[in-house]
Every structure is written in structure tokens, then in C-alpha cells.
Interface confidence: low
């Protein structure tokens, strides 16, 4: 068979643990555009939330902002909490890098983490009694 | 600056590009638990959304589910759209891995991608005319 050489621009796969271990460039490519969020949105959510800082130096990104619903009910047009409605968290699984072995500056392991991004409002379950 | 000695258990940082390039174990640590979402939630959101599949085989994760708000207004308790309220997207920046250089099997770069996770409801801006 013909040996197809790896492009000279590729790092050597001398790591005996390849494909389990790969090389990752931490210089982030930022293709995302900032979220457009008018500054007064947060005061106008019907299911508002606060953001809590979750910091872990053994993780990359080390800071994750976690949303926490401010109320169990939802805020109506008059600004009052309506307990007939419910504020519920919206969660998403994200990818982070965890230092492994711990405290090593150059060695990480992929980890999936569930984070709460915000809250939304749901109407209650209505059970019709026949 | 003081050079902080690496723990003896850490892999050698022979990569001349350290700290930009690090070694990553792809065996995912999955500490997260699946989001608990009762099956009937989606029918009860006041700002419902649909999920669109965003697929890119050159990225990890290759499939990202993007939320798209179903209405411009919000759904009231009677199940009708209320145009005095607005459904707005909740966005989050996530990390993905992209092959770089493109043709290398063992070399990746972190990339930030903005995704829409769900939608929430906001009350309109009320301008008081004096």
C-alpha cells in the first residue's frame, strides 16, 4: 500500500495515546457575534433571573455564569408575580476542558457540563375533571 | 518572572507553542445529568420555540440544536398570541473544537459560537409621555 504522508503542517502524532490525546490551540477563534440584548431586557422578563458566577480554576473556561430564576411564578404586565404561571430554567450542555492531572498547566480532558442559561415562563398543567 | 515547577505527574511541555497549545484527552468526562424537562413543557411555554439542526462535520460537536422563537408575541393563558408581549431569544456563547490545520487529524482549535438556547417573554417598553 502507498503511505500517504501527513501534511508537513500537521503536528507529529508521536503521542502514543493518539487518537485519545490530541493537541488543542487555546487561542480562541471567535466567530460569534455578541448577543444583542437591550440593556433594559432584564427588567422586562416575565421570568427574570439572576446570574451567579461559577468559578473553577481547574476548568477552562474557568468562569461560567449560571442563571437562577428569581421567582417561582412569572411577572405579569402589572409587574406583579402571578403564581398561576411558573418560571422554569432553560438548560444546555456545554463543552469545557478540565485540567487532568489536576494543576497541570498543559494537560486537559474534555468534559460536558449542564448549565442554566436563563428562565422562561410556562402555563400550569390544567386537569379537566369530567 | 518566577518559573513555577510543573508537578512531576504532568506531561512534558515539549510543544514549543505551550501555553498556546495544550494536550487534551478526548475521553469525555460526563458529569452532567440530562436536563429534566417534562415532555409537556414545550406545549406550555408562553414563548415557545422550535429546534433547528445546525450540522457541521468539521466541528465538534458536529450537531448543534438552535432554537427559533415560534412567535413574535407571547402565548397567554388562553393559548392566544398576545402582541403586547414579545418572545425574545436567549443566547449563549459555547466552546466547540475545530480542526486546525483543517486536514490534520490530531490538531484542533477552540472556537466560540453563539447559539440560541430557547426563548423567553418580555413586557413591552412603556414610554410615559409627560
Amino acid at each position: 500500500g502507498i503511505m500517504i504522508p501527513q501534511s508537513p503542517g500537521c503536528p507529529k502524532t508521536e503521542d502514543k495515546n493518539f487518537p485519545q490525546h490530541v493537541r488543542v490551540n487555546l487561542n480562541i477563534l471567535n466567530r460569534s457575534t455578541p448577543a444583542r440584548r437591550p440593556s433594559d431586557y432584564s427588567k422586562r422578563f416575565t421570568s427574570p433571573w439572576t446570574l451567579q458566577r461559577n468559578e473553577d480554576p481547574e476548568r477552562y473556561s474557568s468562569v461560567i455564569w449560571e442563571a437562577k430564576c428569581s421567582h417561582s411564578g412569572c411577572i405579569n404586565a402589572e409587574g406583579k408575580e402571578d403564581h398561576h404561571m411558573n418560571s422554569v430554567p432553560i438548560q444546555q450542555e456545554i463543552l469545557v476542558l478540565r485540567r487532568e492531572p489536576r494543576h497541570c498547566p498543559n494537560s486537559f480532558r474534555l468534559e460536558k457540563v449542564m448549565v442554566t442559561v436563563g428562565c422562561t415562563c410556562v402555563t400550569p398543567i390544567v386537569r379537566h375533571i369530567s | 518572572g518566577i518559573m513555577i515547577p510543573q508537578s512531576p505527574g504532568c506531561p512534558k511541555t515539549e510543544d514549543k507553542n505551550f501555553p498556546q497549545h495544550v494536550r487534551v484527552n478526548l475521553n469525555i468526562l460526563n458529569r452532567s445529568t440530562p436536563a429534566r424537562r417534562p415532555s409537556d413543557y414545550s406545549k406550555r411555554f408562553t414563548s415557545p420555540w422550535t429546534l433547528q439542526r445546525n450540522e457541521d462535520p468539521e466541528r465538534y460537536s458536529s450537531v448543534i440544536w438552535e432554537a427559533k422563537c415560534s412567535h413574535s408575541g407571547c402565548i397567554n393563558a388562553e393559548g392566544k398570541e398576545d402582541h403586547h408581549m414579545n418572545s425574545v431569544p436567549i443566547q449563549q456563547e459555547i466552546l466547540v473544537l475545530r480542526r486546525e490545520p483543517r486536514h490534520c487529524p490530531n490538531s484542533f482549535r477552540l472556537e466560540k459560537v453563539m447559539v440560541t438556547v430557547g426563548c423567553t417573554c418580555v413586557t413591552p417598553i412603556v414610554r410615559h409621555i409627560s
Epitope: I4, V22 | L26, N27, P57, R59, Y60, S61, S62
Partner: nanobody, 119 residues
Framework: EVQLVESGGGLVQPGGSLRLSCAAS????????MYWVRQAPGKGLEWVAE????????YYVDSVKGRFTISRDNAKNSLYLQMNSLRAEDTAVYYC????????????WGQGTLVTVSS
Amino acid sequence: EVQLVESGGGLVQPGGSLRLSCAASGFTFSSYSMYWVRQAPGKGLEWVAEIKQDGSEQYYVDSVKGRFTISRDNAKNSLYLQMNSLRAEDTAVYYCAKGEILPLYFDYWGQGTLVTVSS
């Protein structure tokens, strides 16, 4: 429904050759990198080779470089592995896999085909 069906395995003497085939269906074959993965008796899974969507680029684990060749025919939705100069340590069940760009992540694979290298 995604289906991957391997064939072509068998018993071969050291130094011999085999050609494995994989018939794919249920997805857009030409949009995905494809892989061969193997599992030797009593061992874990080992990534063997990968071929990019258009067949222009191939990668191999060091132990098979120069002996194995991965190829594909997008018109036939088929993946191949030409195995030459076979050694006893190549004895394994070989799986064809569709996957993510990360070399460990395969979302689908076939039932496998057994390759035994023995005199």
C-alpha cells in the same frame, strides 16, 4: 435509519492481504469523514484509519502506516480498507464507523468483520 455493513474479513497468513468493504445507507455518505476502528481479542477499541468526505485526505494510526490504505466510493456509498503485509497483531474485529471529527467519537458503526492473521 443509519446502517453500516462490513464484509471481507477472514483467515489469512502473515504477510497476506485482505480487502474490507463497508456498505453505508441511511445518511448522506459524502458529507462525512469515515473511519475504520478495530478491537483485538481482550483489548479496547483502536482507531485505525480515517478518510475525509471527498476522499482527498487519509490518516492512519502509526502501526498500520504504509501497510493499510483506506478509500471510498461516494457514488456507491462504500468504504474500503486494503490491508497488506498483515501481521498477527492485526487480528481483530474491524468496524466501519461514521463519526465526529474527533477521532474518538463515532455516532454509528457496523456489526464488524473478523480478521484473523495466523499461520
